[in-house]
Interface confidence: medium
Amino acid sequence: HHHHHHHQGWQAFKNDATEIIPELGEYPEPPPELENNKTMNRAENGGRPPHHPFETKDVSEYSCRELHFTRYVTDGPCRSAKPVTELVCSGQCGPARLLPNAIGRGKWWRPSGPDFRCIPDRYRAQRVQLLCPGGEAPRARKVRLVASCKCKRLTRFHNQSELKDFGTEAARPQKGRKPRPRARSAKANQAELENAY
């Protein structure tokens, strides 16, 4: 039983897996996806130069890295025909100025001074075709992908913003690059790292 799938025109849909993008191009700074620094990977291009007010002799100690991350976009049972590649922001934007903060018997540390983070600076929109099983027609989506990273001072806007997840599924990394695990929202479908097949 063969079913032929016809290509449909690009449309913008509101759904849990993707975010509507009004038009292609660059966008002002939206709420960032803050990465948990459990794993540190080397930057492929070294990232952009750090933007921070701290004075230091060795800038190499901290930098805002742009790591390439390849993943599939998913929406329910549907998945993008091809993986998309975007940047994941990682790195330290200033020297570790930490003060002891005793909580109970454990030793906790909290940062001192302005809180600068390596967060997305620019975004790009990409049109993606999602293939759906069971004879369902393909879906078209516009997804917002991180295009560059920058060290920025966190504001209330950043701190109070809900962390967004665009329902993406990690794909096998490009040669010589290792992906970092991303923070997933509860809304996102149960995306798992892809097996290398």
């Epitope: 799938h5 293939l131 149960q190 995306a191 892809e194 097996n195």
Partner: nanobody, 120 residues
Framework: EVQLVESGGGLVQPGGSLRLSCAAS????????MGWYRQAPGKQRELVAT???????NYADSVKGRFTISRDNAKNTVYLQMNSLKPEDTAVYYC??????????????WGQGTQVTVSS
């Protein structure tokens, strides 16, 4: 030619469990999605659960928390573990396989279906 062979259906009491299996044979491309759909008498075929070769899964709201889909890529087999079955789960369950080549669908295959009846 690809063939899908389903098994595991049957009669079960409400609250019981069943495990469906679907084995695919033939020339199957590695980038694929396998899933289960069901059709009750007088109703349209509906999605139950799907799983991509990459591991991405999706479930119909009506079965979330009760059904679990899994697969064995080496055997080209997909499983559907159905727990806490309800009378409304009664239907013919169909296995589906779709494969992707160079970013487009290469094929879309269906099994013959296996009957699941939940009744006391």
């Amino acid at each position: 030619e690809v063939q899908l062979v389903e098994s595991g259906g049957g009669l079960v009491q409400p609250g019981g469990s069943l495990r469906l299996s679907c084995a695919a044979s033939g020339s199957i491309f590695s980038d694929n999605v396998m899933g289960w759909y069901r059709q009750a008498p007088g109703k349209q075929r509906e999605l139950v659960a799907t799983i991509w070769s990459s591991g991405h899964t999706n479930y119909a709201d009506s079965v979330k928390g009760r059904f679990t889909i899994s697969r064995d890529n080496a055997k080209n087999t997909v499983y559907l573990q159905m727990n806490s079955l309800k009378p409304e789960d009664t239907a013919v369950y169909y296995c589906n396989l779709g494969t992707i080549v160079t970013g487009t669908w290469r094929s879309d295959y269906w099994g013959q279906g296996t009957q699941v009846t939940v009744s006391s």
